[in-house]
Structure formats: C-alpha cells, structure tokens
C-alpha cells in the first residue's frame, strides 16, 4: 500500500534495508560505514551547489528470528517483512537502498506499488531485468551474457580468428550469489546466450567436468565457470588438460589479478579470467580497509547508491521539481554520475555499465595480462595485447569444436 514518504520541506531521508540475508556475507556495520561515508559526500556536494537541505539515512533491520540463513535462500519474505515494518512505522524515505538478493528484490518489486526508486547492490538475476524503478549498481547477469555472446561471435581479433558457437557450463549449486545468477542466466533455455549458441551443456558434477578435460569426444573446447582460482584448483587440481581446452573463469568482483606481486599458478595457463577493471581510490577509504576485494565492490555499491541519490536530488531540487513523484522514481537511469571512484554510467534500464577485462596467463612471465577490454555500455571489444604469449598453439585461441582447430 501507499506509504507517506519522509521526503520534503528540505529534509530528505534514505531508507536502507539492512537484511540478514545478503548477496555477500558482509557485516552490516561495514555497510553502515559505507552509507555514512556516502552521506558525508552528498551533503558536501549539495552544500557546494548552494542547496541548504538535510539528507539522512534510516537503517531498517530485520529481527533475524525467522530469516536467518545468512545467504539469499530465505530472503524472499525478509524483504517484504521489512517493507511491512517500514509501512507500519510510516518511515519510508525518498529512496530504498537494498535488498541485494535477486529473490527478495523480485518479490518486493512484484508485491508493492513502487512509487519510489529502489537501488540494489546485487539483484543479479535476469528476473530483475527491465524493472522501471530498480537501479542495480553491480553488473547483472544480462551484461555478462552480452559479453559472452559478443566474444563467442568475434573472429577478427589477432588472437581469435574463429567464431564459437558451443560451450560447456559448469554449475554445481554451491556458487556464491553472483555466480549462481550468472550461471543461471547461461543455463536458462530462453536466454540470449542459449539462443545464440548451437550447443550448450551444463556440467553439474565434478567428475563430469574432470572427464571433459581429456575427452576426445567432447562437443566443445570451451568451459565457462564462475569463481576464483582456488575454486578452479579444487576442481581441476593438477590434472592434464587437452591443449585446445579454454576455460573461461568468471570472477568479476575480484581485483587481486591486478596486484603487482601476483603470479599466476600453473593450473591457470588454459584459463581466461573475466573480471572488472579495478577501482583505485577505495583502498585508502576508512570503511574498506579490512574488506576483501569482493566485499569492497559490495560496500562501494552501497556508497555509490547514496551518491546516485544525491546526484538525482540535486538535479530535481535545482529544477524546482518534486521528489515524491513517479518522475523522480523513474529517473535513476540513462545517466552518468560522479561515483566514489570516478564516473558511473547507468544504462536505459538503470543497470550499471562497466568495463569487463579478459585476462590470460603469460607463459613467459607467469603473470596475468590484459587480453582485451569490453565496454558494456556500447557492447564493444577493445583488443589490448596484439601478440599474447598464450599457451595455445600459434598464440591464438583454438576453435571451439575439436578437430576443426588446433588439437
């Protein structure tokens, strides 16, 4: 039902859902710190623009009695319970930040009259695509899918001269929330990825994956999986791998690959890692010093959510427009705003655009090197290394079908 918003007369409130079930196991205190840091920046920006207004955040905690799995499995009802709590207390702000779980975001969007914007650090699944008042500040599955299709089709790069049309996808059900939805999108028979590929099989057992590595009758040389190098090692170990196998390891929210002293282990030589371009200024931030790389991205998304709200608030106030209107609720898209770590671009559907980076392991230096970048905003690939020192024959990626390319 319609809830009155604390969002007028020079006082603007942000409702932050602090859910026990979260896309990343992040102490809520860290997210609070991120939000508070964002508020300080927003207040400064509004003051500099000559706007004398108050901006605050209200943190809404769930009781944690019923919904206590800690991951996203029991998040569906937790989000709705929190909304009910907000409704009963008549404490809705101008904008809702959180939830991060796809299940809860989807359900909340479905079951409420959303006349206010909703900003999510997560909600990766395809079911949260194209929602008119939802903004997602971490790369959703759709963006990954578009990269993969683009890369599969590409055949005019110095190091990739074959179009691919086949793939195995490894998905064993133990994935993190981001990986779960990324792989779910690749698995879905109605998805763009499935539609564009001629052959795709999901491997669900460790043994299935391990057998494919040396199976002469395999239907594809390409295997997509999601996780970090350690996850791959647990699965693959030091097993021999056919020389034309290419493993694509999706590890978007991990910038360890860019650290100076990192050496790629030997088991990564057949692997292309897909990650996001690293942030640079977060490392010195007060709220992020003790965070792992993944959690930095999660906390940063909360912080950027606050900055996004501040950006929109400033625009509407400068134009003398009302904040509690459908126009404001639908405005959080198709724009670029000043994020904590530089400009942040949102697409027409409110999803963050980013630069994905494909890395390979140099056989010369045993370092991760950038092969190409991909700009999700324009769906374009930019080759970076013209002569990669690959493990694959002729320093070119093999064909995806055994027997057609180098074997």
């Amino acid at each position: 039902s319609q809830v009155s918003q604390n969002c007028h007369n020079g006082s603007y409130e942000i409702s932050v859902l602090m859910m026990g079930n979260s896309a990343f196991a992040e102490p809520l205190k860290n997210l609070e710190d991120a939000v508070n840091e964002g508020l300080e920046i927003v207040r400064g920006r509004l003051q500099n623009a000559g706007l004398n207004v108050t901006v605050n955040a209200t943190f809404m905690y769930s009781d944690g009695l019923i919904h206590n799995s800690g991951d996203c499995r029991s998040s569906t009802c937790e989000g709705l319970d929190l909304l009910r709590k907000i409704s009963n207390a008549q404490r809705m702000g101008c904008v809702l930040i959180g939830p991060s779980c796809t299940y809860s975001t989807f359900q909340m969007y479905l079951d409420t009259e959303l006349s206010y914007p909703m900003i999510s650090a997560g909600s990766f699944g395809l079911s949260c695509d194209y929602k008119e008042t939802l903004t997602r500040l971490m790369s959703p599955a759709r963006k990954l899918m578009y990269f993969l299709v683009n890369f599969w089709k590409t055949n005019d790069l110095p190091f990739k001269t074959y179009s691919w049309s086949t793939s195995y996808v490894y998905k064993n059900g133990t994935e993190t929330e981001d990986c779960f939805w990324y792989l779910n999108a690749l698995e879905a028979s109605v998805s763009y990825f499935s539609h564009e590929l001629g052959f795709k099989v999901v491997l669900r057992q460790d043994k299935e994956f391990q057998d494919i590595l040396m199976d002469h009758n395999r239907k594809s040389n390409v295997i997509i999986m999601c996780g970090g190098p350690e996850f791959l090692y647990k699965l693959k170990g030091d097993r021999a791998v056919a020389e034309d196998i290419v493993i694509i390891l999706v590890d978007l929210f991990n910038d360890q690959y860019f650290e100076d002293n990192v050496t790629a282990p030997d088991y990564m030589k057949n692997v292309l890692v897909l990650t996001l371009s690293p942030g640079n200024s977060l490392l010195n931030s007060s709220f992020s010093r003790n965070l792992s790389p993944t959690k930095r991205d999660f906390a940063l998304a909360y912080l950027n959510g606050i900055l996004l709200f501040g950006h929109m608030l400033k625009i509407f106030l400068e134009n003398g427009e009302n904040i509690t209107t459908p126009k404001f609720a639908h405005a959080f898209r198709n724009l670029t705003f000043e994020g904590y770590d530089g400009p942040v671009t949102l697409d027409d559907w409110g999803d963050v655009d980013s630069t994905m980076v494909l890395l390979y392991t140099s056989v010369d230096t045993k370092k991760y090197k950038v092969l190409l970048t991909y700009d999700t905003h324009v769906n374009k690939t930019y080759p970076v290394d013209m002569s990669p020192t690959f493990t694959w024959k002729n320093s070119k990626l093999p064909n995806d079908i055994t027997g057609r390319g180098p074997q």
């Epitope: 690293p278 400009p343 970048t373 374009k380 930019y382 080759p383």
Partner: antibody, heavy 118, light 110 residues
Framework: EVQLVQPGAEVKKPGSSVKVSCKAS????????ISWVRQAPGQGLEWMGR????????NYAQKFQGRVTITADKSTSTAYMELSSLRSEDTAVYFC???????????WGQGTLVTVSS | QSGLTQPASVSGSPGQSITISCTGT?????????VSWYQQHPGKAPKLMIY???NRPSGVSNRFSGSKSGNTASLTISGLQAEDEADYYC??????????FGTGTKLTVL
C-alpha cells in the same frame, strides 16, 4: 559527443620537462585508449605512446621509452603526457587522440604547441 | 620502429581517382587488420578517414576507400575534389602492441 581539450602552448627550456594535459569534455575517458602523437614543424605524425585510462596500462614507442610518461586521472577524465630531458628537436605540436579501435584515432585534441628554446 | 613507407607526393585532376600506398612488414601492416588512414589539412588536427583497413567512419564520403594486400595497404580517393588536397597518413599496430604512422603523402589536386 566527447571532445578532447588541450592547453594552447607551452615554452620550455632545454633539459626541463613538460606535462601536457588532455581533458575529455562531454564524456569520460572510458575503456578506450588515449594516444599521444606529435608533429614537428613541417614534419609528419609521430606516435609516442598510449594509455588505457581505466586500467592504467601504457605502451610507448621505443624512441621515447624512458623519456615519456603517460598517465590518466579517471576522476577528472584527464590524460597527461610528460616528456623529460627536453631538447630543441622536441619542439612540436603534441596531440592527444582517443582510439576506440586499435590505431583508429577518431577524436583528436586541438594540439598543444611545445616550444623548447633557451 | 621507423615509419611505414608512403610516397612523398601524389597528384590528380578533379574527377580522377588516385591511390596512396603504405608499405610495412609482416609485424605491422601485414600482421593485423588494423590499418587506418588520416587526412590532415594545414594547421589542423588529423581526421580519421578509414579504420580497420576498409571501414569508413560515419560522415566520411564514400569516395574514400581502403584495402590491403600482404604488407601493403592502400587508400583510394575517387572523383577527386579540391577539398581533398591535404596530407594523408596511414597507421597501424605492431606486434609490440604499439602504433606506427606512415611517412605521409602530400596530395595535390591539379
């Protein structure tokens, strides 16, 4: 539509350094490369190096290796080219340019004339 | 890396076609389909005319076309016009992931 804005001119003494800026207005530096190209009076174009701002990856022409440093500040969408140990033959117009595809520089700055003279 | 080799000058009458060559090695022109061509009028910044051997950016006349054979790339301008008079440069990537320009060709429209 992105434009690259450069300062008009710089006068430097031999042996000193120059740092030329290149600001993207109407857009960001994004994931593409920014190249630096120079042109001495009456001469051809000479590629000096490039940076991919979002990653900080640089490549330099062998001729300038050790003498040129290209950097970028993502937060201000500005790229910089610093050339050290200047000599009179470094007198040239220095252009920055964006390449959306390798070696395809589709947007150019207006150029900065650097004069090296004692 | 010294520049790619181009003829110093080329001329033609209005309405005619001319071709400018750009010769490199298998480590640059011959090795990659990343050859570009630029037009530069005196005192102005260069303008991209052709990229990736034969693609034209939007806004560039279809009188300009590009091709490549082995280690040599070519720019052809058909139906020459007075405003085509300018300097033309080719460029490409190298196996070191650097770029290199051609020596430049002065086009005179007679």
């Amino acid at each position: 539509e992105v434009q690259l804005v450069q300062p008009g001119a710089e006068v430097k003494k031999p042996g000193s350094s120059v740092k030329v800026s290149c600001k993207a207005s109407g857009g960001t530096l994004s994931s593409y490369a920014i190249s630096w190209v120079r042109q001495a009076p009456g001469q051809g174009l000479e590629w000096m190096g490039r940076i991919i701002p979002i990653l900080g990856i640089t490549n330099y022409a062998q001729k300038f290796q050790g003498r040129v440093t290209i950097t970028a500040d993502k937060s201000t969408s500005t790229a910089y080219m610093e050339l050290s140990s200047l000599r009179s033959e470094d007198t040239a117009v220095y252009f920055c340019a964006r390449d959306q595809r390798p070696a395809s520089m589709d947007v150019w700055g207006q150029g900065t004339l650097v004069t090296v003279s004692s | 890396q010294s520049g790619l080799t181009q003829p110093a000058s080329v001329s033609g009458s209005p309405g005619q076609s001319i071709t400018i060559s750009c010769t490199g090695t298998s480590s640059d022109v011959g090795g990659y389909n990343y050859v570009s061509w630029y037009q530069q009028h005196p005192g102005k910044a260069p303008k991209l005319m052709i990229y990736e051997v034969s693609n034209r950016p939007s806004g560039v006349s279809n009188r300009f076309s590009g091709s490549k054979s082995g280690n040599t790339a070519s720019l052809t301008i058909s139906g020459l016009q007075a405003e085509d008079e300018a300097d033309y440069y080719c460029s490409t990537v190298t196996s070191l992931s650097t770029y290199v320009f051609g020596t430049g060709t002065k086009l005179t429209v007679l």
